[in-house]
């Protein structure tokens, strides 16, 4: 046998632990890339889509949501993996049989062209050049994200 | 305290396969994802893959697709892998390593290792 | 594929040096490197993360910086115990890969 066995220093403060954050954010915490006024944090191991809602939101953020195919190509320029996927914040309504957010809107159909069915139990990915219906229980990566709150210039009354 | 026990080492033919185990304690076994890594004799280390222990969810390094299986069983708090159609370049030391976070690609803790012997 | 290259591949040194490791990336990993320590006999031991994070538990010589292509891990007075194999490691891409490690040998 090659190894003795041994114990593991870890750290006390668990990173999968809620963390508390001041509201309103102006720059992006360690670890996750800026994109415009939004922080992304890609996953490193893989989760059905729930699973993946649910871990975003230890980190106080959500499944990433896509306003126009222009944020969607720029999120798809930080992806260096090719055949890798990742869940978004977005699936199938059946009861309103559409395309719904997480945030409650509905897909405007011209902003992503998406591969594959939509039906129930289906979830959105995205890779480095598309975007896929997939069953919801299928294992992948995901992106969280947060917004970034505006800096506003304090107006101050006359003295 | 976190520990990741390895069983112990194996001598197989070329052709044949190997399972290894890792017995994980100290934590939440389905709270951190188990990853693989081996080390050929004097070489350096090579990622094999992951398994979610919570899902089962597996990804893996493409040089391995077709040879590795990775399970787990959160009833013993183990995780498994098994590399089939051993050939003699398969002979090197095996690791199981937790992912330390979710959203990095670090490992926190290692097992002990188990040689893996694979010659005729 | 990211390869990563570390140099001196050996290194003599006597209690008390100051010694340095390279470790130098084929594309940009931003500061997603990982230093691992290993000795003789042992698995191997993190020891910095996110380039320059020490990890818990890991004394202050320990240092390590760098971002991009080249990243270094330094011991600032080496001891005794810190003759092993150091090794880096990549992750910003899924395929993680390491360096062919640095071992560090009393002179």
């Known amino acids: 046998q090659k190894s003795s066995i041994e114990k593991c220093s870890v750290d006390i403060q668990q990173s999968r632990n809620k963390t508390t954050e001041r509201p309103g954010l102006l720059n992006c915490p360690i670890y996750w890339q800026q994109l415009r006024e939004k922080c992304l944090l890609f996953s490193h191991t893989v989760n059905p889509w729930n699973n993946s809602l649910a871990d975003c939101s230890t980190k106080e953020s959500s499944l990433l949501l896509i306003r126009d195919k222009d944020e969607l190509i720029h999120t798809q320029n930080l992806i260096r993996d090719k055949a890798i996927l990742f869940w978004i914040g977005l699936n199938f309504s059946l009861s309103e049989k559409n395309w719904k957010w997480i945030n409650g809107s509905f897909l405007n159909s011209n902003d992503l062209e998406i591969r594959g069915d939509a039906k129930e139990n289906s979830c959105i990915s995205i890779s480095q050049t598309s975007v896929y219906s997939e069953y919801c229980s299928t294992e992948i990566r995901w992106i969280c994200q947060k917004e970034l709150t505006p800096v506003r210039n304090k107006v101050y009354p006359d003295s | 305290q976190v520990q990741l026990v390895q069983s112990g080492a194996e001598v197989k033919k070329p052709g044949a396969s190997v399972k290894v185990s890792c017995k994980a304690s100290?934590?939440?076994?389905?709270?951190?994802?188990m990853n693989w890594v081996r080390q050929a004799p004097g070489q350096g280390l090579e990622w094999m893959g992951l398994i979610n222990p919570n899902t089962g969810g597996t990804y893996y390094n493409q040089k391995f697709k077709d040879r590795v299986t990775m399970t787990r069983d959160t009833s013993i708090s183990t995780a498994y892998m098994e590399l089939s159609r051993l050939r003699s370049d398969d002979t090197a030391v095996y690791y199981c390593?937790?992912?330390?976070?979710?959203?990095?690609?670090?490992?926190?803790?290692w097992g002990q290792g188990t040689t893996v012997t694979v010659s005729s | 594929d990211i390869q990563l290259t570390q140099s001196p591949s050996f290194l003599s040194a006597s209690v008390g040096d100051r010694v340095t490791i390279t470790c130098k990336a084929s594309q940009d990993v931003g500061t997603a490197v990982v230093w691992y320590q290993q000795t003789p006999g042992k698995a191997p031991k993190l020891l910095i993360d996110?380039?320059?994070i020490r990890h818990t538990g890991v004394p202050d010589r320990f240092s390590g910086s760098g971002s991009g292509t080249e990243f270094t891990l330094t011991i600032s007075s080496l001891q005794p115990e810190d003759f092993a194999d150091y090794f880096c490691q990549q992750y910003s891409t899924y395929l993680y890969t390491f360096g062919g490690g640095t071992k560090l040998e009393i002179k």
């Open positions: 390593a937790r992912l330390g976070d979710n959203y990095r690609g670090y490992f926190d803790c």
């Open positions: 996110w380039a320059s």
């Open positions: 100290g934590y939440s076994f389905t709270g951190y994802t």
